[in-house]
Structures are given as structure tokens and as C-alpha cells.
């Protein structure tokens, strides 16, 4: 048998946020039902994780031996602390789209570990704020965006923006 440390060396995690409790659930991406040491995990999920606090999980299974895999869960900031804001100026709304992630609340997670990503059509931007210019008037554009913490996606949003009519005579 392999050690659990080896077997689960490359385990990945998805973070799911509960807006009512303001707590995260970490979903362990494994095929079998693992055990999590002191942390109870139900259906490969570790519940009630506080934003920006690290949690250590000891992963074991009867298909592998000691030592267990020690997984450090880097819990992201609360999702409601981020808002996707349309920053397009009214007078330029016929040919411009502006989108910005706003941090309406502080948090204790290291801001260095947060990555923003926008995809509008086939254009990808790794920025917190984007401005698309020289667009076609009266066209619909879809922009998908996501925020990652330590390369784990923890929130996303999409906006469909229709550019205004062009000025008469243009």
C-alpha cells in the first residue's frame, strides 16, 4: 500500500461559501470517502471554516498507510466582501465597457494571494479592473470573471453588457 501522504500528495480543494453562516466548506476532490482526523468530514467535505483562517486536516483511508496526508486549508476571504461593479462612464457607454471588482470590506487574508481574472469573448485579463474600448455600439458583450485565493477559485460573476446606441451621424 502507498502512504496516504503519497496517495493524496496532489489533492485539490474547492471552497464553497454559505452566505447565511458566512462560513466556508472545503470540498476534497477525491474518489473515495476519506477520514479527516480531528476535523470531521462528511462526504469528503470539511465544514464551518472561518474566512482567512488556516485549518489543518489529516487525511487517511484504509487503502493507504501512515503517515497521513496533512492538508493545510487556506480559507479565502468571505465572498460578500467582493462586488463586481460596472464602472462604465455614461458618456462613453456606446463603445466602452468598464468592470471592476470592489473590496467593500477589509479582511485579514493576504491580498498578495488574490488573483482576479476576466474573460470577455476571447480576451483574457488578469486584472482587478478592466476597460474595453473601441467596441461596437448596440452590441451585447458577456464578461465572465472569477477571483482566486492561492490559485483556488472561490467566487465568480458574469455580466452581460449591451453597449449604447452610437451618437447620430457617427
Amino acid at each position: 500500500k502507498p502512504t496516504c501522504d503519497e496517495k493524496y500528495a496532489n489533492i485539490t480543494v474547492d471552497y464553497l461559501y454559505n452566505k447565511e453562516t458566512k462560513l466556508f466548506t472545503a470540498k476534497l476532490n477525491v474518489n473515495e470517502g476519506v477520514e479527516c482526523g480531528n476535523n470531521t468530514c462528511t462526504n469528503n467535505e470539511v465544514h464551518n471554516l472561518t474566512e482567512c483562517k488556516n485549518a489543518s486536516v489529516s487525511i487517511s483511508h484504509n487503502s493507504c498507510t501512515a503517515p497521513d496526508k496533512t492538508l493545510i486549508l487556506d480559507v479565502p476571504p468571505g465572498v460578500e466582501k467582493f462586488q463586481l461593479h460596472d464602472c462604465t462612464q455614461v458618456e462613453k457607454a456606446d463603445t466602452t465597457i468598464c468592470l471592476k471588482w470592489k473590496n467593500i470590506e477589509t479582511f485579514t487574508c493576504d491580498t498578495q494571494n488574490i488573483t482576479y481574472r476576466f474573460q470577455c469573448g476571447n480576451m483574457i485579463f488578469d486584472n482587478k479592473e478592466i476597460k474595453l474600448e473601441n467596441l461596437e455600439p448596440e452590441h451585447e458583450y458577456k464578461c465572465d470573471s472569477e477571483i482566486l485565493y492561492n490559485n483556488h477559485k472561490f467566487t465568480n460573476a458574469s455580466k452581460i453588457i449591451k453597449t449604447d446606441f452610437g451618437s447620430p451621424g457617427e
Partner: antibody
């Protein structure tokens, strides 16, 4: 190491122009809003310009509006302050400072660059 | 504009004593979102300002717990429970509620008695 290094300060005559630069390193510059803050010879701190992370929004107090322009080049990790129609009251130490968003705080400051406006 | 008035201008203290600095705003700095964006910065001689407190009472990481902030509305206070030599310098309050018209207080110089 997270660092901001200002440059471009000089002695300039009233009515003259000057461009300050602030080189950022050690962090994802394009994710941070940035500001210029100055300190007068009397040691008063004054906020003089603000720019959002992607350069979309800029703000100025009335004292410098129309004379100062803040800009950034995220590809070069550099913040700028173009100052024109300089007055003697613009004499100060100019600091660049980062602020993750408008609702956050200035957590990193540069060491400053000195601008003297005098004939 | 929001005017931030600090008192006293100068505060002579003995090491180990408590120090208290007041900051008063000319109008309420409670934002419509319910938060109060009042910060305190310390500038030591020959250095740039450093953040101590944000949102009235939250200590920035690495700031000793002898520093505490309090207040609401228009009246705010920074307290240092036991002054140490490294605390000497000029303290500035700052309001960030009236975005983007940020304003600093005039400063309070903490010095040895």
C-alpha cells in the same frame, strides 16, 4: 520584499513642471489602487492624487485639480505624478502609497522624493 | 471638505506612562455602508508614515497591543497604554469615509518629558 521607490523630485521654478515616478516591486501592482501623499515643510500630510488599480478612475483634491495628473503603467509596475503650473505651496516631500481599495488603508509607503518650488 | 483636528499638538510623556491623542472631524465620518474609515499613522523621525489602526479600532498586523483606537461619529482617540522609546514620533489621524476627499489631521508629536 514589498517596496515603493519614488524618484524625480527636484528644484523647479514657479510655473514649471515636473514628473515624479514610483517604482513598485514585490507585489501584484495591478491589483492595488495607488495614491500620492505629500508632506509640507511644516510636516502636514496632504493627499494629492488617487488612481484605481486599472487606471480607470482618478481623484484629486481641489488644491491640485487641473494641475496634477496621476497615471500608472501596470506593465512597468510604475506610478506617475505629472505636476504642472507649480506653486511655492507645492514644495513638499512626495510619497507614493498603496491602498488595496478605496475602503482599505495605506499599508505600504515609499521613502519619498523632495520637490522644491522656488525662484 | 472634512477637517480633521488633532489635540494636543505636542504630547510630552514619560516612558511607561499612558498617552492619549484626540482627533475630531468637522462632520460625521460614518459612511452610508455603516463603516467608519478612521485610521492612525505614526511617522518616526526620518521615516515615512506607518499604519497603526484602521476602521477606528482595528490594529494593523504587527502593531503592539499597547496601541488601541476608539471613538465614533466625530470624536476619536488613540491610546498608548505604556509608552516605549520606539513610540516617539508624530501621530496622524486620517479619514477615508468621504471618498475620494481623503484628509489627514495636523499631527501630534509624542516626545519624552
Amino acid at each position: 520584499e514589498v517596496q515603493l521607490v519614488e524618484s524625480g523630485g527636484d528644484l523647479v521654478k514657479p510655473g514649471g513642471s515636473l514628473k515624479l515616478s514610483c517604482a513598485a516591486s514585490g507585489f501584484a501592482f495591478s491589483n492595488y489602487d495607488m495614491s500620492w501623499v505629500r508632506q509640507t515643510p511644516e510636516k502636514r500630510l496632504e493627499w494629492v492624487a488617487y488612481i484605481s488599480s486599472g487606471g480607470v478612475s482618478t481623484y484629486y483634491p481641489d488644491t491640485v485639480k487641473g494641475r496634477f495628473t496621476i497615471s500608472r503603467d501596470n506593465a512597468k509596475n510604475t506610478l506617475y505624478l505629472q505636476m504642472s503650473s507649480l506653486k511655492s505651496e507645492d514644495t513638499a516631500m512626495y510619497y507614493c502609497a498603496r491602498r488595496y481599495d478605496v475602503w482599505w488603508y495605506f499599508d505600504v509607503w515609499g521613502a519619498g522624493t523632495t520637490v522644491t518650488v522656488s525662484s | 471638505d472634512v477637517l480633521m483636528t488633532q489635540t494636543p499638538l505636542s504630547l510630552p510623556v514619560s516612558l511607561g506612562d499612558q498617552a492619549s491623542i484626540s482627533c475630531r472631524s468637522s462632520q460625521s465620518i460614518v459612511h452610508s455602508n455603516g463603516n467608519t474609515y478612521l485610521e492612525w499613522y505614526l511617522q518616526k523621525p526620518g521615516q515615512s508614515p506607518k499604519l497603526l489602526i484602521y476602521k477606528v479600532s482595528n490594529r494593523f498586523s504587527g502593531v503592539p497591543d499597547r496601541f488601541s483606537g476608539s471613538g465614533s461619529g466625530t470624536d476619536f482617540t488613540l491610546k498608548i497604554s505604556r509608552v516605549e522609546a520606539e513610540d516617539l514620533g508624530v501621530y496622524y489621524c486620517f479619514q477615508g469615509s468621504h471618498v475620494p476627499m481623503y484628509t489627514f489631521g495636523g499631527g501630534t508629536k509624542l516626545e519624552i518629558k
